[in-house]
């Protein structure tokens, strides 16, 4: 099945903003929202935002977790919100990569 | 509760090893990724090494790269810290740390004192 | 590498006091930044995570505030048990902490 081609004039939609790009802002505008975990020498770094340009969230999105990051992507308003990218998890799809709890 | 008891430290001359452990008891230590952090005599704080849950990838600063190495066994909940090479400016008490994914090092050890002097 | 600096580097308080440490980082570390506290002879403690986070068991008269550059450390009503060296930590990139603040009381 093709990609989904981007409309003339693409839905936007308001996603929340969490992370260095974010400014001093909470929220921002794209065409997809996504949740992301980066892990930084050795350390979780959480992040929430928007994508403005649909390739940019076209890459990104498709791209498969691996041990040191993880990004989660949907469309609509505020669908980011409720998402926390993990890792992969041990023995599932993606061998050598690790599995986290919070507990 | 969460337990952490490091060993290990004592006094070394400059240039020797030592090997520092951390014994891990009362959350499930084969999920978590693990630290190490120092303290000179008066001092304030540095991150020295992270492990991942499998140990498979490894984090050092700059200035221990290549002397030091974190490692786990997780059969034993055990974290090591292989110190080689060691300079004065090691001289430290050395903390075992551990973070959950949202809280970084949220729990730490009492910590053991690395002397290094001639 | 990110650098961290506090002040004061020491803070003469008295009991009941409200008293507010600065942590600062030299570039935009979001929120990724935690408070810790050590007192005389033991390990440091978590106080808050990810700025603004009280660490369960630490009483509410702790808070902290800040985002990208410039971060804070509120004592709303100072205790003798709050007598210590905090510490801020940041872990958005090259984990470094904080140089320290004594806090003492007066």
């Known amino acids: 099945m093709e990609d989904e081609k981007p409309k003339v004039n693409p839905k936007l939609y308001m996603c929340v903003c969490e992370g260095l790009s974010c400014g001093n802002e909470d929220h921002c505008e794209g065409q997809q929202c996504f949740s992301s975990l980066s892990i930084n020498d050795g350390f979780h770094v959480y992040q929430k935002g928007c994508f403005q340009v649909y390739e940019q969230g076209k890459m990104t999105c498709k791209t498969p977790p691996s041990p040191g990051q993880a990004v989660e992507c949907c469309q609509g308003d505020w669908c980011n919100r409720n998402i926390t990218a993990q890792l992969p998890t041990k023995g599932k799809s993606f061998p050598g990569t690790q599995n986290f709890h919070l507990e | 509760e969460v337990q952490l008891v490091e060993t290990g430290g004592g006094l070394v001359q400059p240039g020797r090893s030592l090997k520092l452990s951390c014994v891990a008891s009362?959350?499930?230590?084969?999920?978590?990724?693990m630290y190490w952090i120092r303290q000179a005599p008066g001092k304030g704080l540095e991150w020295i090494s992270s492990i991942n849950t499998d140990g498979g990838s490894t984090y050092y600063p700059d200035s221990v790269k290549g002397r030091f190495a974190i490692s786990r066994d997780n059969a034993e909940n055990t974290v090591y810290l292989q110190m080689n090479s060691l300079r004065s400016e090691d001289t430290a008490t050395y903390y075992c740390?551990?973070?959950?994914?949202?809280?970084?090092?949220?729990?730490w050890g009492q910590g053991t004192l690395v002397t290094v002097s001639s | 590498d990110i650098q961290m600096t506090q002040s004061p580097s020491l803070l003469s308080a008295s009991v009941g006091d409200r008293v507010t440490l600065s942590c600062k980082a030299s570039?935009?570390?979001?929120?990724?930044l935690n408070w810790f506290q050590q007192k005389l002879g033991e390990a440091p403690k978590l106080l808050i995570y990810y700025s603004n986070s009280l660490q369960t068991g630490i009483p509410s008269r702790f808070s902290g505030s800040g985002s990208g550059t410039d971060f804070t450390l509120t004592i709303s009503s100072l205790q003798p048990e709050d007598v210590a060296i905090y510490f801020c930590?940041?872990?958005?990139?090259?984990?470094?902490f904080g140089p320290g603040t004594k806090l003492e009381l007066k």
């Open positions: 740390a551990k973070s959950t994914p949202n809280i970084p090092l949220a729990y």
């Open positions: 570039q935009n570390i979001y929120k990724y």
């Open positions: 009362g959350f499930t230590f084969s999920n978590y990724y």
């Open positions: 930590f940041q872990y958005s990139s090259g984990p470094t």
